[in-house]
């Protein structure tokens, strides 16, 4: 006569995180008397998942009516699957005794959990950098499974090639993380630019996740200065303007010096914005020529975004 067999028909089962996993198990006989137990893993450290005889297993339900007289189906459903539930599950028949003894085990079913990666988080350098400099951006995404994942970098829709990516851990794990660093060369036109990290994974059904960084938070475009003398507005008065062009960000302080002495300090307020996102600003100084006996050196000194000041001078001729 044939001895009881424990049949686990599925070698592997893959389930999305949050869903329920059904693990199939049937026995070929009701002999011997004794419970079915489900375990995750094998050996002394195996974890009890369900015991037909006793215990409370809130996430586990039996697929068939386990108390039914003829029942030989001991398939279970585990609800709200997380990556931590991944592993090999064994359906084990025990023989009634004091204590119950293991009689026969099924071959096991490997449960793999498909978990979506978290939304990629892109972070740039701590300090701003100027055009022509290379800056690094990092992209991180966590909690995905299986390990296979694709990460791409884009700048304004153009794919970048200078990046390095690591998926951790290297060995088997319930879930994984990806970390990538991309190098980007800044240009003066990058105020409106975006760097995008795109993550594609089997759980996303062809709809990748994206993380974005605006280069406006990374770039500093230093201003160009031009000081010009305007036609005389009134007798003994000369209007001198300082054109501050193509700067970003807006934080800018301008100081006028007459022969090295501070005449006036002001902060950029009513700026005009260029198409590329940089700003222009103009400051003017009304110089009373009659107050000067000699030529005057006028200096427009600009401190932009906390950087060392840049300046432009203009010599004002005072006629005898």
């Amino acid at each position: 006569e044939e001895e009881l067999q424990v049949i686990q028909p599925d070698k592997s089962v893959s389930v999305a995180a949050g869903e329920s996993a059904i693990l199939h198990c049937t026995v070929t006989s009701l002999i011997p008397v004794g419970p079915i137990q489900w375990f995750r893993g094998a050996g002394p450290a195996r974890e009890l998942i369900y015991n037909q005889k006793e215990g409370h297993f809130p996430r586990v339900t039996t697929v068939s009516e386990s108390t039914k007289r003829e029942n030989m189906d001991f398939s279970i459903s585990i609800s709200n699957i997380t990556p931590a539930d991944a592993g090999t599950y064994y359906c084990v028949k025990f023989r009634k005794g004091s204590p119950d003894t293991e009689f026969k085990s099924g071959a096991g079913t490997e449960l793999s959990v498909r978990a979506k990666p978290s939304a990629p988080v892109v972070s740039g350098p701590a300090a701003r950098a100027t055009p022509q400099h290379t800056v690094s951006f990092t992209c991180e995404s966590h909690g995905f499974s299986p390990r296979d994942i694709t990460l791409k970098w884009f700048k304004n829709g153009n794919e970048l090639s200078d990046f390095q990516t690591n998926v951790d851990p290297v060995g088997e794990s319930v879930s994984y993380s990806i970390h990538s660093t991309a190098k980007v060369v800044l240009t003066r036109e990058d105020v409106h630019s975006q760097v995008i990290c795109e993550v594609a994974h089997v759980t996303l059904q062809g709809d990748p996740l994206r993380g974005t960084a605006n280069l406006s938070e990374t770039i500093r475009v230093p201003p160009t200065l031009e000081v010009t003398q305007q036609p005389v507005r009134a007798e003994n008065q000369v209007n001198v303007t300082c054109q501050v062009r193509k700067f970003y960000p807006q934080r800018l302080q301008l100081t006028w010096l007459e022969n090295g002495n501070v005449s006036r300090t002001e902060t950029a307020s009513t700026v005009t914005e260029n198409k590329d996102g940089t700003y222009n600003w103009m400051s003017w100084l009304l110089v009373n020529v009659s107050a000067h006996r000699d030529d005057v050196k006028l200096t427009c000194q600009v401190e932009h975004d906390g950087q060392p000041a840049v300046s432009k001078s203009h010599d004002l001729k005072v006629s005898a």
Partner: antibody, heavy 115, light 111 residues
């Protein structure tokens, strides 16, 4: 689906008897067959269960004197060293207890031990 | 071995009465629920009513119910019918395979 016992009868003290329990309408291969007896005017008494070769067991009082075997359609119980107190109706039932209770039952066969 | 004590040993009741029979085990039954109830009428084989302490067997009327866990169990007939006059046995299972013991029986007679 039923069980039919046979093999009962009159036997002398110290004698032996082989009882049969034949299934019709279902197979015994995936179930145990349990034996229960009832002395005249008394209650039910569990004797033992016949599963596969390895999984056959008897109540402590029946060990040694009673043995059993089974095919896919018939279960057997050998009674030996019979005594007058073994006089009873012997029932077979499908099942091994706990989640496999005794059901259905045969109609019973009377064993009388007397000289 | 497990010992099953049934009470009462007999009772008289009328049709429509609610009848309760108890069964006490000398130790906790296997899995706290290895307890079945059987009905036997004169000259017939026993018939399964309840198993796993509270599971109604197929084809058994819903007026029969079982309850209890561990050592104390009850069979209730909510409204006694003429065909229910019979002897009722509990069968308890201990921790070992062969440790199955019937109670001494409760005879339900017509008052």
């Amino acid at each position: 689906r039923q069980l039919v016992e046979s093999g009962g009868g009159l036997v002398q003290p110290g004698g032996s008897l082989r009882l049969s329990c034949t299934a019709s309408g279902f197979s015994l291969s995936s179930h145990g067959i349990s034996w229960v007896r009832q002395a005249p005017g008394k209650g039910l008494e569990y004797i033992g269960t016949i599963g596969t070769g390895v999984i056959t067991y008897f109540a402590s009082w029946a060990k040694g004197r009673f043995t059993g075997s089974k095919t896919s359609s018939t279960a057997y119980m050998e009674l030996s060293s019979l005594r007058s107190e073994d006089t009873a109706v012997y029932f077979c039932a499908r099942g091994s207890a706990w989640n496999d209770p005794f059901d259905p039952w045969g109609q019973g066969t009377l064993v009388t031990v007397s000289s | 071995d497990i010992v099953m004590t049934q009470s009462p040993s007999s009772l008289s009741a009328s049709v429509g009465d609610r009848v309760t029979i108890t069964c006490q085990a000398s130790q906790s039954v296997y899995g706290n629920n290895d307890l079945a109830w059987y009905q036997q009428k004169p000259g017939q084989a026993p018939k399964l009513l309840i198993y796993l302490a509270s599971t109604l067997a197929t084809g058994v009327p819903s007026r029969f119910s079982g309850s209890g866990s561990g050592t104390d169990f009850t069979l209730t007939i909510s409204s006694l019918q003429p065909e229910d006059f019979a002897t009722y046995y509990c069968l308890g299972g201990g921790d070992d395979e062969a440790d199955n013991t019937f109670g001494q029986g409760t005879k339900v007679e017509i008052k």
